[in-house]
């Protein structure tokens, strides 16, 4: 697995460099997770043809993966820092159950999947420190998450491959939108 942000060789070689600001650390953390997702997507796409055929094969998607909408205040038009930050944190918390599901879905990238999961937990902590209105953030219900995980794992192999692909694609899109929004804050 790649070295987490702040632990690369350049950091060791340059001890007198200014420490990263909170915003820089968050930016770097998201980019690190996105690199991890790219590696996982590579394995998924190499293993099956899900990446090309998923659009036309899908009739109904009940996964309820977090997605940015206009009302969330994260887009340039109607940008609202506080609303957007709440959406990013809430979305990441909702993605956690799906990242847990991914843990046993990879053969050669098992460590990478774990790194994406753990780095996301760290990112949530960074963002929670930045948020003023923590009361507005709803944490997913553990019982609901446990039931969802059971349903996902009960699907046949083909559907599990499709689910893996859709989770990675949605998580990538969510993080990219988050990154753009956070750079405006």
């Amino acid at each position: 697995a790649p070295v987490p942000p702040g632990e690369d060789s350049k950091d060791v070689a340059a001890p007198h460099r200014q420490p990263l600001t909170s915003s820089e650390r968050i930016d770097k953390q998201i980019r690190y997770i996105l690199d991890g997702i790219s590696a996982l997507r590579k394995e998924t796409c190499n293993k099956s043809n899900m990446c090309e055929s998923s659009k036309e094969a899908l009739a109904e998607n009940n996964l309820n993966l977090p997605k940015m909408a206009e009302k969330d205040g994260c887009f340039q038009s109607g940008f609202n820092e506080e609303t957007c930050l709440v959406k990013i944190i809430t979305g990441l918390l909702e993605f956690e159950v799906y990242l847990e599901y991914l843990q046993n879905r990879f053969e050669s990238s098992e460590e990478q999947a774990r790194a994406v999961q753990m780095s996301t937990k760290v990112l949530i902590q960074f963002l929670q420190k930045k948020a003023k209105n923590l009361d507005a953030i709803t944490t997913p219900d553990p019982t609901t998450n446990a039931s969802l995980l059971t349903k996902l794992q009960a699907q046949n192999q083909w559907l599990q491959d499709m689910t893996t692909h859709l989770i990675l694609r949605s998580f990538k899109e969510f993080l990219q939108s988050s990154l753009r929004a956070l750079r405006q804050m």
Epitope: A59, E60, K151, L159
Partner: nanobody
Framework: QVQLAETGGGSVQAGGSLTLSCAAS????????MGWFRQAPGKEREFVAV???????YYTDSVKGRFTISRDDAKNTVYLQMNSLKPEDTAVYYC???????????????????WGQGTQVTVSS
């Protein structure tokens, strides 16, 4: 284990109608998506229609407006009403079921766990 049995196939003139039925064994019928696929001689088995466990129907483009899929959960049966039949609709029609409460309803064979034996539909011009 789910067993599926199709009935209602037969021969019909172009422009005619047929209704296929698929009876399923087991008590968990209402929590499964149910689909119809077809296979013409020398061709791949292809998706025709599916009705999700939430009740939403989906169709392949070539049958939209002509075929209607429906389900009766009380009778553990799914139906395919086929109107304005064309010679190119000639095929063996298979009923398929997913596992329970699938999160994804798909138009691909891989998404289905249980299959019937098939019923022949022949449309002559």
């Amino acid at each position: 284990q789910v067993q599926l049995a199709e009935t209602g196939g037969g021969s019909v003139q172009a422009g005619g109608s047929l209704t296929l039925s698929c009876a399923a064994s087991g008590r968990t019928f209402s929590s499964r998506a149910m689909g119809w696929f077809r296979q013409a001689p020398g061709k791949e088995r292809e998706f025709v229609a599916v009705i999700s466990w939430t009740g939403s129907p989906y169709y392949t483009d070539s049958v939209k407006g002509r075929f209607t899929i429906s389900r009766d959960d009380a009778k553990n049966t799914v139906y395919l009403q086929m109107n304005s039949l064309k010679p190119e609709d000639t095929a063996v029609y298979y009923c398929a079921a997913t596992s329970e409460h699938v999160m994804l309803v798909v138009t691909t064979r891989g998404g289905y766990d249980y299959w019937g034996q098939g019923t022949q539909v022949t449309v002559s011009s």
